[in-house]
Interface confidence: low
């Protein structure tokens, strides 16, 4: 089951996702996609980072936090009802099949007559940012190959089989936050 986040039409939506770099500046590629996390990569990629920088993004999707410290939370500007749905945050940890996958459900509500602030959780309390670094030396990033044209229909069955049953517990315990290294 996905963790649900809400925003109103015309406002910005925030989808939290964090990891802890193994060492300062030792970044791990991350992709954000529209739709549940497939087996590899992200489907319908809206934003991607590499070991150095944000290397791909689309209109209205950006990282507001300090991604160099592992805050890869996605902000979607000026949302519409069409932005509702599942989003995948995939942290491409070195090692095959070691990727961390977080499915987050975004629910967009029609704007109220009287505009109100975006309903968000208290993420500081619910999702403590575990951004302490660990004492490993530089580590080469070993990600899966880029699969931009992956067919979600073809692999949906396998994706369901591989979906991590512990996701809900992990999100409950630490938010979409993982440690690398």
């Amino acid at each position: 089951s996905e963790v649900e986040y809400r925003a109103e039409v015309g406002q910005n939506a925030y989808l939290p996702c964090f990891y802890t770099p193994a060492a300062p500046g030792n970044l791990v590629p991350v992709c954000w996609g529209k739709g549940a996390c497939p087996v590899f990569e992200c489907g319908n990629v809206v934003l991607r980072t590499d070991e150095r920088d944000v290397n791909y993004w689309t209109s209205r999707y950006w990282l507001n936090g300090d991604f160099r410290k592992g805050d890869v939370s996605l902000t979607i500007e000026n949302v519409t009802l069409a932005d509702s749905g599942i989003y995948c945050c995939r942290i491409q940890i070195p090692g095959i099949m070691n990727d961390e996958k977080f499915n987050l459900k975004l629910v967009i509500k029609p704007a109220k007559v009287t505009p109100a602030p975006t309903r968000q959780r208290d993420f500081t309390a619910a999702f403590p940012r575990m951004l302490t670094t660990r004492g490993h030396g530089p580590a080469e990033t070993q990600t899966l190959g880029s699969l931009p044209d992956i067919n979600l229909t073809q692999i949906s069955t396998l994706a369901n089989e591989l979906r991590d049953s512990r996701l809900a517990n992990d999100l409950r315990d630490s938010g979409a936050t993982i440690r690398i290294g």
């Epitope: 095959i96 099949m97 490993h136 080469e140």
Partner: antibody, heavy 117, light 113 residues
């Protein structure tokens, strides 16, 4: 120092079962992508099965439905339950681990499995 | 799965001579995001676990003699032993770690002529 120690190998009749164990040092086990390889006499290395730190498993076609990989995080131990064994499963079985932040693999010394009547 | 094909299956080389092993993958193992080839070379001796020699196709593992070198990119790779020593007699494997399962080549047995 990283250590992987396999056990549980031996002689078994066709159709029988064995359970291999691999005891690993804590850090590599809790974070590691763990695999079983095997090398049959005169043959190359073959990936038998793998499991990542979150429990996602992978099997070679030749063992699907017969072998089950699992891990006990509380004991830092990797297992390979081998059922319906066949003569062609005879091999030295190696436990190997890959840490997420490293490329190199760590290997155990291997345990012999012989399937013969 | 990515298929890995090694050639030759075996070769015999005189001591001090060059040994060359080829490895071909059925699809590219190069990831352009980080300009890395996800290919390693292992040495396997009887009764011993495999030993990593080369990773990222051309990076020598710590402690591996510099007579071992790796080259190539995309789908075609080569392991070269520049001056064969008696202790180099073994079976050598290439392995891709671009996608799961991490598939191995069939191995190349290196002997002394």
């Amino acid at each position: 120092e990283v250590q992987l120690v396999e056990s549980g190998g031996g002689l078994v009749q066709p159709g029988g079962s064995l359970r291999l164990s691999c005891a690993a040092s804590g850090s590599i086990f809790s974070n590691g992508y763990m695999t079983w390889y095997r090398q049959a006499p005169g043959k190359g290395l073959e990936l038998v099965s793998s499991i990542n730190s979150r429990g996602v498993t992978n099997y070679a076609d030749s063992v699907k439905g017969r072998f089950t990989i699992s891990r006990d995080n509380s004991k830092n131990t990797l297992y390979l339950q081998m059922n319906s064994l066949r003569a062609e499963d005879t091999a030295v079985y190696y436990c190997a681990a890959l840490l997420p932040h490293e490329i190199r693999k760590y290997w155990g010394q291997g345990t012999q499995v012989t399937v013969s009547s | 799965d990515i298929q890995m094909t090694q050639s030759p299956d075996s070769l015999a080389v005189s001591l001090g001579e060059r040994a060359t092993i080829n490895c071909k993958s059925s699809q590219s193992v190069f990831y352009n995001s980080n300009n890395k080839n996800y290919l390693g070379w292992y040495q396997k001796k009887p009764g011993q676990p495999p030993k990593l020699l080369i990773f990222w196709a051309s990076t020598r593992e710590s402690g591996v003699p510099d007579r071992f070198s790796g080259s190539g990119s995309g789908t075609d790779f080569t392991l070269t032993i520049s001056s064969l020593q008696a202790e180099d007699v073994a079976v050598y494997y290439c392995q891709q770690y671009y996608s799961t399962p991490r598939t191995l080549g069939g191995g190349t047995k290196v002997d002394i002529k």
